[in-house]
């Protein structure tokens, strides 16, 4: 799935926030060296998901999945020749 | 590398108005229940988070986008 390929750490953090799992969020944020104030801020966002219940989390997860798999992200507008792919892998 | 559309959605979630955020979501998923949920979450975040909190959340996002794991 394209989501996992593009920026796995983003989706780790997003789904940890949306799931309401504080331990998982802490683990994900450790991977990017988040400071204590940064962790506090992310936990405030997480609180909103927890307070609004399971359906809210599922619906927002649906939004993120829809955007991530939209043509804006999937490459309908993107060059995809072999030459370009070679260039793109060199760029990183 | 994060998709620009995802980056924008998250940025608006933190820095946009509720109307802006909901309209952005509507471009991808125009179901009333989804949009109502987006507004509820956005309003909650705006109520809970100070400007400093939002700056810190944006800082985390910046760390995510520039991480080797992204």
């Amino acid at each position: 799935v394209k989501m996992a390929e593009t920026c796995p750490i983003f989706y780790d953090v997003f789904f940890a926030v949306a799931n309401g799992n504080e331990l998982l969020l802490d683990l994900s944020l450790t991977k990017v060296n988040a400071t204590e104030p940064e962790r506090t801020a992310m936990k405030k966002i997480q609180d909103c998901y927890v307070e609004n219940g399971l359906i809210s989390r599922v619906l927002d997860g649906l939004v993120m999945t829809t955007i991530s798999s939209s043509k804006d992200c999937m490459g309908e507008a993107v060059q995809n020749t072999v030459e370009d792919l070679k260039l793109n892998t060199l760029g990183r | 590398e994060i998709c620009p559309a995802v980056k924008r959605d998250v940025d608006l979630f933190l820095t946009g108005t509720p109307d802006e955020y909901v309209e952005q979501v509507a471009q991808y998923k125009a179901l009333p229940v989804v949009l109502e949920n987006a507004r509820i979450l956005k309003n909650c975040v705006d109520a809970k988070m100070t400007e400093e909190d939002k700056e810190n959340a944006l800082s985390v996002l910046d760390k995510i986008y520039t991480s080797p794991l992204c």
Partner: antibody, heavy 120, light 107 residues
Framework: EVQLVESGGGLVRPGGSLRLSCAAS????????MNWVRQAPGKGLEWVSS????????YIADSVKGRFTLSRDNAKNSLYLQMHSLRPEDTAVYFC?????????????WGRGTLVTVSS | DIQMTQSPSTLSASVGDRVTITCRAS??????LAWYQQKPGKAPKLLIH???SLESGVPSRFSGSGSGTEFTLTISGLQPDDFATYYC?????????FGQGTKVEVK
């Protein structure tokens, strides 16, 4: 100081090819998506193409899709536009522009442009 | 594609005048709109982004407003240096589009 310097423009026959380059300096190149915008003589601005920081997302205008290829070399702080099957309507000043946001955005810095003339 | 329509195409004004340029989008662009100034033979210069945010270094006589489909650029007291062509640009989609331009000329 942010600087964008385009090169590679010139006179080319219809059906011909040309490669434009944009040398960037004064900022962290990998932090920004980059674009080409063109302006035909006496006309308005037309967006041509955009490339994200690490080339994962490359967007091309329908008017040039299949003929123009966009790439960047982050090690050289350079942006490239390879143009094939050129038409008279591609005649324009081509500007290299830096995006001010993420990968679809406004353009906060522009180069001076390079003129491409397609004529027989 | 989202079409951007500017009005008027040409505007005759004098130094000190209050000038307003309108930009309409064929569909909502939320607040993803920028304004540029361009002088002959030069590259465009960013004035305003996100409909109303003034770019750093741009004089405060320039202001932007609007959201959705209708936007305006206002120059509160026209200066000699402001005679130029102005363009709006939407960036709500990954393929941005520009208005056709408004030329502000000396009356």
């Amino acid at each position: 100081e942010v600087q964008l310097v385009e090169s590679g423009g010139g006179l080319v026959r219809p059906g011909g090819s040309l490669r434009l380059s944009c040398a960037a300096s004064g900022f962290t190149f990998t932090s920004y998506a980059m674009n080409w915008v063109r302006q035909a003589p006496g006309k308005g601005l037309e967006w041509v193409s955009s490339i994200s920081s690490y080339s994962s997302y490359i967007y091309i205008a329908d008017s040039v899709k299949g003929r123009f290829t966009l790439s960047r070399d982050n090690a050289k702080n350079s942006l490239y536009l390879q143009m094939h099957s050129l038409r008279p309507e591609d005649t324009a000043v081509y500007f290299c522009a830096r995006e001010g946001y993420s990968a679809y955005s406004y353009f906060d810095f522009w180069g001076r442009g390079t003129l491409v003339t397609v004529s027989s | 594609d989202i079409q951007m329509t500017q009005s008027p195409s040409t505007l005759s004004a004098s130094v000190g005048d209050r000038v307003t340029i309108t930009c309409r989008a064929s569909q909502s662009v939320i607040s993803w709109l920028a304004w540029y100034q361009q002088k002959p033979g030069k590259a465009p210069k960013l004035l305003i982004h996100r409909a109303s945010s003034l770019e750093s270094g741009v004089p405060s006589r320039f202001s932007g407003s609007g959201s959705g489909t209708e936007f305006t650029l206002t120059i509160s007291g026209l200066q000699p240096d402001d005679f130029a062509t102005y363009y709006c640009q939407q960036y709500n989609t990954y393929f941005p589009t520009f208005g056709q331009g408004t030329k502000v000329e000396v009356k």
